[in-house]
């Protein structure tokens, strides 16, 4: 949950690619005004997930979740929250 | 803002070699089945995507990272 808060559109696109859902990918890419060549590139990546099957998608989703919830990322998120609190306090 | 570790993972997935990408994944999930899958996906992406495709994927990632939705 926390990871999606850091950059929701990234995780939208990533999970659309990994799920192999072309419609979902198109919807996500429309949100960032993706060009046709950019869409083509992402669909080539999506093809690899589709070709390698469900287990492959699950395993790569697990990797992304693990990285996103690792101390490397969570430490960063906590640090950002602390900075935000400081700024808010100073702003008053 | 996207976490630098996630950004590095995606960058290596697109622009690195299979060795580099798998090494990066291993720092977070060192299960043989996960690493083998990472190598398979990376090999597939390298075989499918041209230099132009990868440039386009990188430009899309830039749009994502700088989007108000990120």
């Amino acid at each position: 949950v926390k990871m999606a808060e850091t950059c929701p559109i990234f995780y939208d696109v990533f999970f659309a690619v990994a799920n192999g859902n072309e419609l979902l990918l198109d919807l996500s890419l429309t949100k960032v005004n993706a060009t046709e060549p950019e869409r083509t590139a992402m669909k080539k990546i999506q093809d690899c997930y589709v070709e390698n099957g469900l287990i492959s998608r699950v395993l790569d989703g697990l990797v992304m979740t693990t990285i996103s919830s690792s101390k490397d990322c969570m430490g960063e998120a906590v640090q950002n929250t602390v900075e935000d609190l400081k700024l808010n306090t100073l702003g008053r | 803002e996207i976490c630098p570790a996630v950004k590095r993972d995606v960058d290596l997935f697109l622009t690195g070699t299979p060795d580099e990408y798998v090494e990066q994944v291993a720092q977070y999930k060192a299960l043989p089945v996960v690493l083998e899958n990472a190598r398979i996906l990376k090999n597939c992406v390298d075989a499918k995507m041209t230099e132009e495709d990868k440039e386009n994927a990188l430009s899309l990632l830039d749009k994502i990272y700088t989007s108000p939705l990120c």
């Epitope: - | 697109l14 622009t15 299979p18 390298d46 075989a47 230099e51």
Partner: antibody
């Protein structure tokens, strides 16, 4: 056009050291991964090492690990191979080769090679 | 370490004949297999990348196929200038070359 020119080869005694250089031109050197590959006289090709575009990542074949070091100087458009503890079996023509951008074509351009002879 | 085994080691062929060289990997490498041509006293040249993609400037008589562990380089109508040694290279896990296949003209 892409040009890779190796230099620094020569005759060296077993246990000795040598540093090979590869001067690159005709492309943006700092964007490309680079390799060293060797070929013993009358034998096949053997990949030795590669280095990432920024120089932060290096990989080696088991046969040279711990003895050879690959490095690069992007400001000078140069690739290097420091070879220590040389053995007779390291005698070969050493080639530097470029990878296509973003790992799109390993070994797409090669230099003409430089001969290293290890003998007492 | 991934081992690549090429066959045959040597092939003597007449011009216009079709040449087939195979490369077998000791484990699956997807499509991360590349073919090189080396003429005597020259450095190698890339012919085919990622199993089946022709490199720029390579004559159309050269083609590649395969995936996983079994790969093939085909020279459709051999020309005299094709006399050379052909090597496969895998880039899936570090890099390793096959032992080479020497093709000469009868």
């Amino acid at each position: 056009q892409v040009q890779l020119v190796e230099s620094g080869g020569g005759l060296v005694k077993p246990g000795g050291s040598l540093r090979l250089s590869c001067a690159a031109s005709g492309f943006t050197f700092s964007d490309y991964y680079m390799n060293w590959i060797r070929q013993a006289p009358g034998k096949g090709l053997e990949w030795i090492s590669y280095i990432s575009s920024g120089g932060s990542t290096t990989y080696y074949a088991d046969s040279v690990k711990g003895r050879f070091t690959i490095s690069r100087d992007n400001a000078k458009n140069s690739l290097y191979l420091q070879m220590n503890s040389l053995r007779a079996e390291d005698t070969a023509v050493y080639y530097c080769a470029r990878d296509g951008k973003y790992n799109t074509s390993p070994g797409d351009y090669w230099g003409q090679g430089t001969l290293v002879t290890v003998s007492s | 370490e991934i081992v690549l085994t090429q066959s045959p080691d040597f092939q003597s062929v007449t011009p216009k004949e079709k040449v087939t060289i195979t490369c077998r990997a000791s484990q699956s490498i997807g499509s991360s297999l590349h073919w090189y041509q080396q003429k005597p006293d020259q450095s190698p040249k890339l012919l085919i990348k990622y199993a089946s993609q022709s490199f720029s400037g390579v004559p159309s008589r050269f083609s590649g196929s395969g995936s996983g562990t079994d790969f093939t380089l085909t020279i459709n109508s051999l020309e005299a200038e094709d006399a050379a040694t052909y090597y496969c290279l895998q880039s899936s896990s570090l890099r390793t070359f096959g032992q080479g296949t020497k093709v000469d003209i009868k």
